[in-house]
């Protein structure tokens, strides 16, 4: 028995070959012997039953001369899954058609971090098929009647080529995923005390009408609990602020990409925030983490100090050096100091290896007097 796979809504071609490789009389039947179609010697396709009953069934007349008499079934339905019989040259050939339906849950447009379940349904009790989907960038996921893709990323968007294999027979189908998310899952902003701060939250997708609501929660390093800094609505890509904290005095841009500004970086604002965006008609939320690190260099009496506040990695080095000289002090800590600094332009550096994340300069005029 030959096996043919077909996807619901598409077409399937059931083979029937003559050993003579020439035109001959043939008939396609259902397993209950009802005639579907055939050719009875005049090269004319004869259909069984009423036209409306069998209008989805056809054959390839152009292939008959070569001894090929396929049964074409268009707009496949689940109930087409059954055995079909081709009668020719005093023999019967049985062809098993397995029609499967693909469902995507919760759909093919998802939010970053969500999971997609692809399910193959069929009326026939077939053994487990192998389902494999491959992204154009090379990522492969496989399963059987159920295929799961968890923790989806923006880069998982686009076309996936999927194959269903059963008894070495293959059927192809495609799916286009749209994973909505921010371009970056996390970002960090380094600022000297008093500098303006800008946070940008670019989305990694574009849609004509983008509607939803969002909020930025902030956990300052110095604070015991987090606080809502701003809530906003998004309507057709227009941002409108609903509620904003009075300290800091935040401003938010009215158009995408989502953008926030703080008039100045202060130690009490250093910390990390979580921007959440809930989109209309989508379950779940998009998240982006943002971190603010603030640096301050000061001189009090005989002590030159450099401090950083906010979420810094343990491998970051904080240094104090007189310009164009070797570092006087360098530590993997959040504060460094020099006692009785000599006069000149001092530099405080926060660095990751040889990459400087930020620096602050302070002019020491003479021991005990300074000017930033």
């Amino acid at each position: 028995k030959t096996l043919v796979l077909g996807k619901e809504g598409e077409s399937a071609e059931l083979p029937c070959e003559s050993s003579q490789k020439k035109i001959t009389v043939f008939t396609w039947k259902f397993s209950d012997q009802r005639k579907i179609l055939g050719q009875h010697g005049k090269g004319v396709l004869i259909r069984g039953g009423s036209p409306s009953q069998f209008d989805r069934f056809d054959s390839k007349k152009g292939a008959w001369e070569k001894g090929s008499f396929p049964l074409i079934i268009n707009k496949l339905k689940m109930e087409d899954s059954q055995t079909y019989i081709c009668e020719l040259e005093n023999r019967k050939e049985e062809v098993e058609l397995w029609v499967f339906k693909v469902t995507f849950s919760p759909g093919t447009s998802l939010l970053q971090g969500q999971s997609l379940t692809l399910t193959l349904d069929s009326n026939s009790k077939v053994s487990n098929p192998l389902t494999e989907c491959k992204h154009k960038k090379g990522k492969v996921v496989s399963g059987s009647k159920v295929l799961s893709m968890s923790n989806l990323r923006v880069q998982d968007s686009d076309f996936w080529n999927c194959t269903v294999t059963l008894d070495q027979k293959k059927n192809w189908f495609g799916m286009t995923l749209s994973v909505l998310g921010f371009q970056k899952a996390s970002s960090i902003v380094y600022k000297k005390e008093g500098e303006q701060v800008e946070f940008s939250f670019p989305l990694a997708f574009t849609v004509e009408k983008l509607t939803g609501s969002g909020e930025l929660w902030w956990q300052a390093e110095r604070a015991s609990s987090s606080k809502s800094w701003i809530t906003f609505d998004l309507k057709n890509k227009e941002v409108s602020v609903k509620r904003v904290t009075q300290d800091p005095k935040l401003q938010m841009g009215k158009k995408l990409p989502l953008h926030l500004t703080l008039p100045q970086a202060l130690p009490q604002y250093a910390g990390s925030g979580n921007l959440t965006l809930a989109l209309e008609a989508k379950t779940g939320k998009l998240h982006q983490e943002v971190n603010l690190v603030v640096m301050r260099a000061t001189q009090l009496q005989k002590n030159l100090t450099c401090e950083v506040w906010g979420p810094t990695s343990p491998k970051l080095m904080l240094s104090l050096k007189l310009e164009n000289k070797e570092a006087k002090v360098s530590k993997r800590e959040k504060a460094v100091w020099v006692l009785n600094p000599e006069a000149g332009m001092w530099q405080c550096l926060l660095s990751d290896g040889d990459k400087v994340k930020m620096d602050s300069r302070i002019q020491v005029l003479s021991r005990g007097v300074n000017q930033t």
Epitope: Q196, V197, E198, K235, N236, K237, E238, S240, V241, Q251, M252, G253, K254, K255, H259, T261, P263
Partner: antibody, heavy 119, light 107 residues
Framework: EVELLESGGGLVQPGGSLRLSCAAS????????MSWVRQAPGKGLEWVSG????????YYADSVKGRFTITSDNSKNTLYLQMNSLRAEDTAVYYC????????????WGKGTTVTVSS | AIQMTQSPSSLSASVGDRVTITCRAS??????LGWYQQKPGKAPKVLIS???SLQSGVPSRFSGSRSGTDFTLTISSLQPEDFATYYC?????????FGQGTKLEIK
């Protein structure tokens, strides 16, 4: 060609009310955000109020908040500014302006209508 | 509200001169700033949007730039028709705010 024509200006006593209209032609009104901008005699430009294309979001300068109301009637392609509790400092030429598709700038302006608040 | 500080408030120059007008924003406003020209008794006209995008029909002698929260309008070679008042406008967020204006006069 897109054109904006303001009307409804005039002389009004302090504490009085006026309704300004801005009739638009040559555009699909509901697509664009609109604004009212004023200019007091011999002074600079002051943004007064704005409304989103959908008409759902309205915005005001602090100087007029609670006294002025911006609305639009998409079926009539008309923008309105209802001005209540008028003060002498509201005396100005009032311009209506259409914003670009992505709120980039005010690309079309009306010729203005004069409002004088005086006893 | 975001404050826009425009300078100078007035400027005398001659035809052919290179002129710069500056606006400083009290907050970061990305590139969401436009420059407008107004002649006496007329409505304002947009010259530049989004900091540096020259509007169609505006001569190329007009240009805009940004450094942090400082925005500059430059007229490379003044023409007689350029004598007018110039305003910057932040449209980053509501309420929008104009600069105080710069009156450009013939020296």
């Amino acid at each position: 060609e897109v054109e904006l024509l303001e009307s409804g200006g005039g002389l009004v006593q302090p504490g009085g009310s006026l309704r300004l209209s801005c009739a638009a032609s040559g555009l699909t009104f509901s697509t664009f955000a609109m604004s009212w901008v004023r200019q007091a005699p011999g002074k600079g430009l002051e943004w007064v109020s704005g409304i989103s294309g959908s008409g759902e979001n309205t915005y005001y300068a602090d100087s007029v908040k609670g006294r002025f109301t911006i609305t639009s009637d998409n079926s009539k392609n008309t923008l309105y500014l209802q001005m209540n509790s008028l003060r002498a400092e509201d005396t100005a030429v009032y311009y209506c302006a259409k914003e670009g598709y992505n709120w980039n700038y005010m690309d079309v302006w009306g010729k203005g209508t004069t409002v004088t608040v005086s006893s | 509200a975001i404050q826009m500080t425009q300078s100078p408030s007035s400027l005398s120059a001659s035809v052919g001169d290179r002129v710069t007008i500056t606006c400083r924003a009290s907050h970061g406003i990305r590139n969401d700033l436009g420059w407008y020209q107004q002649k006496p008794g007329k409505a304002p006209k947009v010259l530049i949007s989004e900091t540096s995008s020259l509007q169609s029909g505006v001569p190329s002698r007009f240009s805009g730039s940004r450094s942090g929260t400082d925005f500059t309008l430059t007229i490379s070679s003044l023409q007689p028709e350029d004598f007018a008042t110039y305003y910057c406008l932040q449209d980053y967020t509501y309420p929008y705010t104009f600069g105080q204006g710069t009156k450009l006069e013939i020296k």
